[in-house]
């Protein structure tokens, strides 16, 4: 039998994207990053 149509079956988890800029001292500039779900990826 052919299968009926359904979704992929995978849960969709909505994650928060957080852009941040952190001042690390006048002579070192700034760190700019992107945190996805609590993990810094850039």
């Amino acid at each position: 039998d052919a299968e009926f149509r359904h979704d992929s079956g995978y849960e969709v988890h909505h994650q928060k994207l957080v852009f941040f800029a952190e001042d690390v001292g006048s002579n070192k500039g700034a760190i700019i990053g992107l945190m996805v779900g609590g993990v810094v990826i850039a």
Epitope: A2, H6, G9
Partner: antibody
Framework: QVTLKESGPGILKPSQTLSLTCSFS??????????VGWIRQPSGKGLEWLAH???????YYNPSLKSQLTISKDTSRNQVFLKITSVDTADTATYYC????????????????WGQGTTLTVSS | DVLMTQSPLSLPVSLGDQASISCRSS???????????LEWYLQKPGQSPKLLIY???NRFSGVPDRFSGSGSGTDFTLKISRVEAEDLGVYYC?????????FGAGTKLELK
């Protein structure tokens, strides 16, 4: 709230074509993942699934009746239609439409909402 | 077609009893996405069917917790822990994994 209501001719003669309409409110078939199906029930007997149509016009039919069935929709009027050609006395039944949704926004992949049914009698 | 076999076809009970309805499918109804689309519906005389359980064991909103569904593969069960008068009617199992979608023949829950 979601409501569905079926309408049909009530009585037909054998060999005629049955045209059913399901008019619904509370959702739109233009919404990704939405679908409406048809199920019938001869008096005092069990339920038989007939056909289903999805928002993107993807259609599924019961293979045992596929040559007789045509399901279609009018998205702007919130209606779904079922045609059954060459009806016989065995097609005497109550016909229901029901909603099923596979969208992640409304993940209701089950027949949670049904119409009240419309009764067809096929008699010569 | 996937044949859904329910037993018993008639189930006489007294109010307050536990009731158990079996549903067996003629083949696995596990979909390729990993879900099992096994549902239970209750139909009372003169009414359209009402959803009780979806995906084997999930109670639909508003369904009392005396209803529970279980099973896997081809063997499924609906249990009602304490039958109330409003529970009387015909129970149908249903598979939504394979075309054609199919219902069991129904189990009539009635008073002894």
């Amino acid at each position: 709230q979601v409501t569905l209501k079926e309408s049909g001719p009530g009585i037909l003669k054998p060999s005629q074509t049955l045209s059913l309409t399901c008019s619904f409110s509370g959702f739109s078939l233009s919404t990704s993942g939405m679908g409406v199906g048809w199920i019938r029930q001869p008096s005092g007997k069990g339920l038989e699934w007939l056909a289903h149509i999805w928002w993107d016009d993807d259609k599924y039919y019961n293979p045992s009746l596929k040559s007789q069935l045509t399901i279609s929709k009018d998205t702007s009027r919130n209606q779904v239609f079922l045609k059954i050609t060459s009806v016989d006395t065995a097609d005497t039944a109550t016909y229901y439409c029901a909603r099923r949704s596979i969208t992640t926004v409304v993940p209701e992949d089950y027949f949670a909402y049904w119409g009240q049914g419309t009764t067809l009698t096929v008699s010569s | 077609d996937v044949l859904m076999t329910q037993s018993p076809l008639s189930l006489p009970v007294s109010l307050g009893d536990q009731a158990s309805i079996s549903c067996r499918s003629s083949q696995s109804i596990v979909h390729s996405n990993g879900n099992t689309y096994l549902e239970w519906y209750l139909q009372k005389p003169g009414q359209s069917p009402k959803l009780l359980i979806y995906k084997v064991s999930n109670r639909f909103s508003g369904v009392p917790d005396r209803f529970s569904g279980s099973g896997s593969g081809t063997d499924f069960t609906l249990k009602i822990s304490r039958v109330e008068a409003e529970d009387l009617g015909v129970y149908y199992c249903f598979q939504g994994s394979h075309v054609p979608l199919t219902f069991g023949a129904g189990t009539k829950l009635e008073l002894k």
